[in-house]
Amino acid sequence: KSSNEATNITPKHNMKAFLDELKAENIKKFLYNFTQIPHLAGTEQNFQLAKQIQSQWKEFGLDSVELAHYDVLLSYPNKTHPNYISIINEDGNEIFNTSLFEPPPPGYENVSDIVPPFSAFSPQGMPEGDLVYVNYARTEDFFKLERDMKINCSGKIVIARYGKVFRGNKVKNAQLAGAKGVILYSDPADYFAPGVKSYPDGWNLPGGGVQRGNILNLNGAGDPLTPGYPANEYAYRRGIAEAVGLPSIPVHPIGYYDAQKLLEKMGGSAPPDSSWRGSLKVPYNVGPGFTGNFSTQKVKMHIHSTNEVTRIYNVIGTLRGAVEPDRYVILGGHRDSWVFGGIDPQSGAAVVHEIVRSFGTLKKEGWRPRRTILFASWDAEEFGLLGSTEWAEENSRLLQERGVAYINADSSIEGNYTLRVDCTPLMYSLVHNLTKELKSPDEGFEGKSLYESWTKKSPSPEFSGMPRISKLGSGNDFEVFFQRLGIASGRARYTKNWETNKFSGYPLYHSVYETYELVEKFYDPMFKYHLTVAQVRGGMVFELANSIVLPFDCRDYAVVLRKYADKIYSISMKHPQEMKTYSVSFDSLFSAVKNFTEIASKFSERLQDFDKSNPIVLRMMNDQLMFLERAFIDPLGLPDRPFYRHVIYAPSSHNKYAGESFPGIYDALFDIESKVDPSKAWGEVKRQIYVAAFTVQAAAETLSEVA
């Protein structure tokens, strides 16, 4: 429970007062307001929304609300020269063309400035050639193609289904395989849940629906032209040839009606197994090229998008802390959308808006949080987390000294089944305690806690009676705060039943059909799940900003470090002969983890006993907690990924969305049996064990008694 002592406020102004002020009806109203027109990054419409949010946050009572602008590289289709893909015959005539735009949803037929589906940052080009179907274009899919099936993608146009991994990883894999173009499509197996109708009659993807998205491989760099530094007025920009993370081959997304027309003619090899088959009525032949009758036909891409340096705007609101104004708790989520943003991001932005309103109401009644709370409406998240990253680069010195925690607030829902939380282990106990105090919105759990319904529906694979909490990966605005700066971070949203719905994300993700009506009719008519997410996100911010002792439990880090060390050791032990030959030992890592466990335990004991009325000792203990996450940062970063600096967690090298533990060791071990120089490869494994062991030991020592 929060204490009120430090901020001299009446008992009324506690967590309960904050939570009771949050209203589902307000979230609904805000969502409607934010979703009536597109708010694409870099457009006038999104600038106007930034100014509206700035104005409303001021009205709600924040101390200051400023716009922070940057000039970053964005990507747009050419309005007069549309992107499309053709099937061409031997004479070069286009006998089939993919669609130029999605059929607009009912009621939106006359809306202007709906950007047609495109892969942001695709280079221009008109490659033509034979098609190869590459399943999800994952690392293992290309291994299957190249190593097992002996199929060469060099000089081919590959077609890959969306899902399983971040689309940028698919494009990177295709490039490395030598492809000269990539077609991405949504297969009904992944984006059409059985027994549900297509939009507008249900929440499934219609055949003309297409997923937009960027295809960068930024690895945390932010603006591709100014890696490491803010894209401000005096920025030095790289040339486009030196830009970070840009794809080198044309890429374009299509829906399943168009995919059907491309895939139905495929010849060549049969799919290797059933995991390569989707739900279309096509053979899912791998190719290369079309079958017999159509073997002279080719596929041609026509991509004319342009990359442009464009101004973007973050909104930054401040609620100054009464006791520790130099300690920052940040709640941030993005504002830019691909089209209407009914779920992504405005279901999150509407929740942030209501959280700001509730905090503002308390402030107007005389309350202040103990610590400063910063609220952020990020721009250009969809173009590579650009707004949040540029702001963090500009303010990195303040953040690394003063940043207590970052809570992310993108989409509040991706389903309506149960809670989903990804966070640092430091926040596990905070999340558990908070959800025990909140009511479950789920049917069949009336009068029960959110913790109870969450644990029942999404149990922890390791600890009975506890809910699953996942590792942080990336693909959202917490990335720079956690992976680069080492600020304790977390995110929460309502999700689907992963057991019964094995499609990727939600079906209408990044399509024109992500509307207000999608949410209001099909996902959350009462906005009760949105309200619950507001309570979780807002409650976390409240506790982090207001509790006298920071609600971090370092013992939970000790538990996961042991688990991650066991896991990486077992991966390495798949090569017992090489471990012996090259004298690979994990003793240093296990020793460091043991030391961390003991020191964390002693620190926790001291935390129970120290004199909380002594502000110096209190600040000292809190600083040790705040800086623990920072202690896992290696200033040199991970190999070839300088902006991923957290030694315990990084986005997977094979899927940006997923988190990997001990990523340095993991990557060194990955596919090690295929390395041309095993001695060098195992040497790198040993180096990464050394880095990890040192970092864990160093982090442990930050929790030791200071003198």
Epitope: F96, G207, G208
Partner: nanobody, 123 residues
Framework: EVQLVESGGGVVQPGRSLRLSCAAS????????MNWVRQAPGKGLDWVAF????????YYADSVKGRFTISRDNSKNTLYLQMNSLRPEDTAVYYC????????????????WGQGTLVTVSS
């Protein structure tokens, strides 16, 4: 009320041109593929042409290929059929018909028809 209204028919000499229009109301033309279908006197229905909702693909019956052009103006909620080099065998009532599937890439079943406009090709 959902309806399609054809216009532009008439009597024309062989070798001349005619342009048919089809005005849609009560539904958004922009979301649907559209067809022209004809019925010659005493004969069954013949499909003539199809255009996808976005205009990216056009398909024609072999008998009209190279002579007829289907087009659309989604902003005006109107479908067109430009008929050149008309022949006596093109004499028919011409109907526009809405495809039933949103976003279809090839002709499917029709679910809304116009009342038709008569084209007579005669010297």
């Amino acid at each position: 009320e959902v309806q399609l209204v054809e216009s532009g028919g008439g009597v024309v000499q062989p070798g001349r041109s005619l342009r048919l229009s089809c005005a849609a109301s009560g539904f958004p033309l922009i979301s649907y593929g559209m067809n022209w279908v004809r019925q010659a006197p005493g004969k069954g229905l013949d499909w003539v042409a199809f255009i996808t909702y976005d205009g990216s693909n056009r398909y024609y019956a072999d008998s009209v290929k190279g002579r007829f052009t289907i087009s659309r103006d989604n902003s005006k909620n109107t479908l067109y059929l430009q008929m050149n080099s008309l022949r006596p065998e093109d004499t028919a009532v011409y109907y526009c018909a809405k495809d039933r599937i949103v976003g279809a890439r090839v002709p499917d079943a029709y679910d809304i028809w116009g009342q038709g406009t008569l084209v007579t090709v005669s010297s």
